[in-house]
């Protein structure tokens, strides 16, 4: 018996010594009963009895993916030859957190790479990291079920003032990075244009120094600095930002010509290239992807294309000469 037409060499599976033609002949009514699929899995070609040499494919339910070798083979003794296969969750389940914490965005399942933000009622901050990312089937960093809210010293200090400021009598003055920032505040990845270096800084210290007119400090992203796309884009964005006509304060960040400020998350979100304004003075001559032709784009279009991580080479500022 062969499950494939024999038009040449009988196939040998990886790590399998026996050829199909070497399998002993069997009675038609013998074979293997339906195997038990792994948890959250099912058998694709389901039936009551399988012939010797026949393979079944293990598939996983939506939200899960197969890890390991997903084929079982029916052996002459009526058992199944099966490797280690399991259905691993490819999405993260909404974490269970204390009632006082709000999860944004609020969904039942989150795809790999999606992040959630935990927030507290006004005047309180999360006593630990506030941003978590779905990686595989778990959250990074792990979410402690004892995570709660604590009184926000930043809010208490600032009163009705801007971030990085505090109330002093009837006026607002800059916080002192040394004196006013001894309490816990979340980590930010920050770029210093003077030293041309990036580093992790507590939010309070960053805001206080920015308030003291340290214009060379630029917010890159929430959380400690880690190599990767987020950091790359943060650095490139900082370089482009010096020519932006729009500089709109947005939480820790500043939004530029190619961005909108998301009020609910206090984050800058990049537009799509077709959503950009037309014209403008800040123009660049670029080469797109693998194209050899040059194209003049404005700063908004350049920002959106780079934000979307599309290939583009900036040849020089200003219009293309040709």
């Amino acid at each position: 018996f062969s499950i494939m037409e024999n038009n040449g060499q009988p196939c040998i599976n990886d790590d399998e010594e026996m050829k199909e033609v070497d399998l002993p002949e069997i009675e038609a009514d013998s074979g293997c009963p339906q195997p038990v699929p792994p948890e959250n899995g099912f058998i694709r070609n389901e039936k009551q009895l399988y012939l010797v040499g026949e393979d079944v494919e293990i598939s996983c339910l939506t939200g899960f993916e197969t890890v390991g070798y997903q084929y079982f083979r029916c052996l002459p003794d009526g058992t199944w030859r099966q490797g280690d296969v399991e259905c691993q969750r490819t999405e993260c389940i909404k974490p269970v957190v204390q009632e006082v914490l709000t999860i944004t965005p609020f969904q039942r399942l989150y795809r790999i790479g999606e992040s959630i933000e935990l927030t507290c009622p006004k005047g309180f901050v999360v006593a630990g990291p506030s941003r978590y990312t779905c990686q595989g089937n778990s959250w990074t960093p792990p979410i402690s079920n004892s995570l709660t809210c604590e009184k926000d010293t930043l809010t208490k200090l600032k009163g009705h003032c801007q971030l990085g400021q505090k109330q002093s009598g009837s006026e607002c003055i800059c916080m002192s990075p040394e004196e006013d920032c001894s309490h816990h505040s979340e980590d930010l990845c920050v770029f210093d244009t003077d030293s041309n270096d990036y580093f992790t800084s507590p939010a309070c210290k960053f805001l206080a120094e920015k308030c003291l007119n340290n214009q060379q400090l630029h917010f890159l992203h929430i959380g400690s600095c880690q190599d990767g796309r987020q950091l790359e884009w943060g650095l490139e964005r900082t370089r482009l930002s010096s020519n932006s006509t729009k500089k709109e304060s947005c939480g820790y960040d500043t939004c530029y010509d190619w961005e909108k400020c998301s009020a609910s998350t206090s984050k800058c979100v990049c537009l799509l290239p077709p959503q950009c304004f037309k014209g403008g003075n800040q123009l660049y001559c670029v080469k797109m992807g693998s194209s050899t032709s040059e194209k003049t784009l404005n700063i908004c279009e350049v920002g959106t294309i780079r934000c979307a991580n599309r290939k583009m080479e900036i040849l020089h500022p200003g219009k293309c000469l040709a």
Epitope: K260, K267, L272, Q275
Partner: antibody, heavy 123, light 106 residues
Framework: QVQLVQSGAEVKKPGESLKISCKAS????????INWVRQMPGKGLEWMGQ????????NYNPSFQGQVTISADKSISTAYLQWSSLKASDTAMYYC????????????????WGTGTTVTVSS | EIVLTQSPATLSLSPGERATLSCRAS?????LHWYQQKPGQSPRLWIY???KRATGIPARFSGSGSGTDYTLTISSLEPEDFAVYYC?????????FGQGTKLEIK
């Protein structure tokens, strides 16, 4: 859950004005672009334009520019599509749809669609 | 504007068969997105960024392609898959949809 609920069916005469609505719930209305899409009877989908309720920024399909006005009232999480003078050719189903964002960039597609509003213009 | 041409206009197949829907762009697009629409219902996001299935979409659906040629494939049709499918681009203004492919039961 995230929902876009549109106003009921409308029957109008040519030359009349009309404003249809799209009420959002379950998400931060100000932070997402709302788009309007037309579907004429038995036909395909046509993008009309969009609004960003956070700052009332709009983008229109040149084919619809000047024909309709898109607006929003973020205090009641509602977007609007309006005509000052309807024509028989405006007879169609109109959908509002949300353009989401993922990570730190908006996306090119619509992840949530409204219930649809049928507009009939006939003398 | 970028014109998206879907073919065939109508595809008549039986449950269990494989369906291949095509969408051709008049000029190169970065990504293509697909929606499903059933009679009397609103469209629903089906495949985004060329090949990613939207939440809850079965694994029998897959998307592929690049440049100007894109495909939506259904490996083995189920009765609930019969509907109209639209492709969509927004690489350049205005955002455009294909005219749709009606997938009907043979």
């Amino acid at each position: 859950q995230v929902q876009l609920v549109q106003s009921g069916a409308e029957v109008k005469k040519p030359g009349e004005s009309l404003k249809i609505s799209c009420k959002a719930s379950g998400y931060a209305f100000s932070d997402y672009w709302i788009n309007w899409v037309r579907q004429m009877p038995g036909k395909g989908l046509e993008w009309m334009g969009q609004i960003y309720p956070g700052d009332d920024d709009t983008n229109y399909n040149p084919s619809f520019q000047g024909q309709v006005t898109i607006s929003a009232d973020k205090s009641i999480s509602t977007a609007y599509l309006q005509w000052s003078s309807l024509k028989a050719s405006d007879t169609a189903m109109y959908y509002c749809a949300r353009e989401g964002y993922y990570g730190y960039t908006y996306v090119e597609y619509f992840d949530v669609w409204g219930t649809g509003t049928t507009v009939t213009v006939s003398s | 504007e970028i014109v998206l041409t879907q073919s065939p206009a109508t595809l008549s197949l039986s449950p269990g068969e494989r369906a291949t829907l095509s969408c051709r762009a008049s000029s190169s697009v970065s990504y293509l997105h697909w929606y499903q629409q059933k009679p009397g219902q609103s469209p629903r996001l089906w495949i985004y960024d060329t090949s990613k299935r939207a939440t809850g979409i079965p694994a029998r659906f897959s998307g592929s392609g690049s440049g100007t040629d894109y495909t939506l494939t259904i490996s083995s049709l189920e009765p609930e898959d019969f509907a109209v499918y639209y492709c969509q681009q927004w690489t350049s203004n205005p955002l455009t949809f294909g005219q749709g492919t009606k997938l009907e039961i043979k």
